[in-house]
């Protein structure tokens, strides 16, 4: 409030200068301050059924100044108004009041959400997010090769986050089982990540089922079809071994 | 809603005199600090006086002081400009309009020509 | 007095396009500051105070900024019925004082 507050010690005239404490430069016993040195704001202060002026470094809380050649004045705002402009606009409410277009109000209007922290309504933000990224490449516990069956998974990023009554985002990552013609690991290239591999287009015939929740998928198991027993894993390597041409097609 | 209708503007050769008025509605005239600002032909704002809510206090921008007085009449909800001594260079339209710092309302504003 | 020094005095730009406008005060006013919009034949219109600070049913494409001596007002997409002449005015102290004005004019 930076208060410098004058008040008169001794009973004077009201526009006998001497004796006044403070920032006054004129005051009177029944009235406190009457006017007040270069540059400080005069104001009314309510005590009981009394005003009293006084003079100020700058406006209090709850008043606004404004600055006439021959004084500086405090003026009240609204009442439920804390800081303003002027008696119209409102730029800070009370304690329990959203501003909104220099007004305070009690609850936000339709289509504005309260911000609890600027206490401010607000347009409602709703999640936005971006296209989805390619497929990664096909995978297995992290390696490209020495698989038939593994998962791939995509992301898309939040774009804008959504405020308290906005549209909550939808998943940002998704992920499928994809299908491969098995390839042996090569020797180096044992323990390789999908990532580091050069993608190529996806093998005719392909089957991938998309599942839009990748972290319920990253911890399931294996359905039972999708188990290979050892007999017909026996089969698939004389296959492999007859084939003249080794398909090397990673997805 | 807020209303602010100016009259009493025309035309008036140099060194006579012309009165404006306001008529106010829609808000709370006597609340309001309330000042003319006036705009030649094609030119900018220029602020020419304000009286403050209870009329006891008046100010005039320097190209009027001494040659135009500023006044109101709360019972009635009406502003006034008293302009003696007019000048060519007076030649605006006038604007009534509620002064808080910000110029919040205005009225449609009265033309005032001085020619001889 | 403050002077106020608003550039540029006209300004033409077409629909959907980004403008500003500027006002340089002589001194220090921190914000108390307001932009009006004025059509031809018509009285100015407040439409931003507080340096910052949207008027009610002044579209949010407006907006106000700066603090000091340096204020900005910025259309981020013009429409049709933006054109007009803008006017910037110091708050801090009598006399009132107002900037120029930028006649912005459909290009």
């Known amino acids: 409030q930076n208060a410098s507050r004058g008040r008169r010690q001794r009973r004077m005239h009201p526009n006998v200068s001497q004796g006044c404490q403070g920032g006054c430069a004129t005051c009177s016993d029944y009235n406190g301050c009457l006017s007040c040195k270069p540059r400080l704001f005069f104001a009314l202060e309510r005590i009981g059924m009394k005003q009293i002026g006084v003079c100020l470094s700058s406006c209090p809380s709850g008043y606004y100044g404004t600055r006439y050649p021959d004084i500086n004045k405090c003026t009240k705002c609204k009442a439920d108004c804390d800081t303003c402009f002027n008696k119209n606009f409102c730029t800070k409410c009370k304690s329990g009041f959203y501003l909104h277009l220099g007004k305070c109000l009690d609850n936000c209007p339709e289509g504005l959400e309260a911000n609890n922290h600027t206490m401010e309504c607000v347009s409602i933000v709703h999640c936005e997010v971006s296209e989805w990224n390619p497929w990664s490449p096909c995978t297995k516990k992290g390696k490209t090769c020495g698989f038939k069956r593994g998962t791939e998974t995509r992301v898309r990023e939040i774009i804008q986050h959504p405020s308290a009554k906005g549209n909550l985002c939808p998943p940002t990552n998704e992920t499928r089982k994809c299908t491969v013609q098995r390839k042996k690991c090569q020797k180096g290239e044992r323990g390789k990540k999908g990532r580091e591999r050069k993608r190529k287009k996806p093998n005719k015939g392909e089957s991938k089922e998309a599942i839009p929740d990748s972290k319920s998928l990253e911890s399931s198991k294996e359905i039972p079809e999708q188990r290979e027993n050892k007999q017909q894993q026996k089969k698939r390597k004389v296959q492999d071994k007859q084939k003249s041409v080794s398909v090397s097609t990673v997805h | 809603e807020v209303q602010l209708v100016e009259s009493g503007g025309g035309v008036v050769q140099p060194g006579r005199s012309l009165r404006l008025s306001c008529a106010a509605s829609g808000f709370t005239f006597s609340d309001y600090d309330m000042a003319w600002v006036r705009q030649a032909p094609g030119k900018g704002l220029e602020w020419v006086a304000t009286?403050?809510?209870?009329?006891?206090?008046?100010y005039f921008g320097d190209s009027v002081r001494g040659r135009f007085t500023i006044s109101r009449d709360n019972s009635k909800n009406t502003l006034y400009l008293q302009m003696n001594s007019l000048r060519a260079e007076d030649t605006a339209v006038y604007y009534c309009?509620?002064?808080?710092?910000?110029?919040?309302?205005w009225g449609q504003g009265t033309m005032v020509t001085v020619s001889s | 007095d403050i002077q106020m020094t608003q550039s540029p005095s006209s300004l033409s730009a077409s629909v959907g396009d980004r403008v500003t406008i500027t006002c340089l005060v002589s001194?220090?006013?921190?914000?108390?500051f307001v932009w009006y919009q004025q059509k031809p034949g018509k009285s100015p219109k407040l439409l931003i105070y507080a340096a910052s600070r949207l008027q009610d049913g002044v579209p949010s494409r407006f907006s106000g900024s700066g603090s000091g001596t340096d204020f900005t007002l910025t259309i981020s997409s013009l429409q049709p019925e933006d054109f007009a002449t803008y006017f910037c005015?110091?708050?801090?102290?009598?006399?009132?004082?107002f900037g120029q004005g930028t006649k912005l004019e459909i290009k």
């Open positions: 001194e220090d006013i921190s914000n108390d």
């Open positions: 005015q110091q708050s801090y102290k009598y006399p009132p004082t």
């Open positions: 009286i403050i809510y209870d009329g006891s206090r008046a």
């Open positions: 309009t509620a002064h808080d710092r910000s110029f919040d309302y």
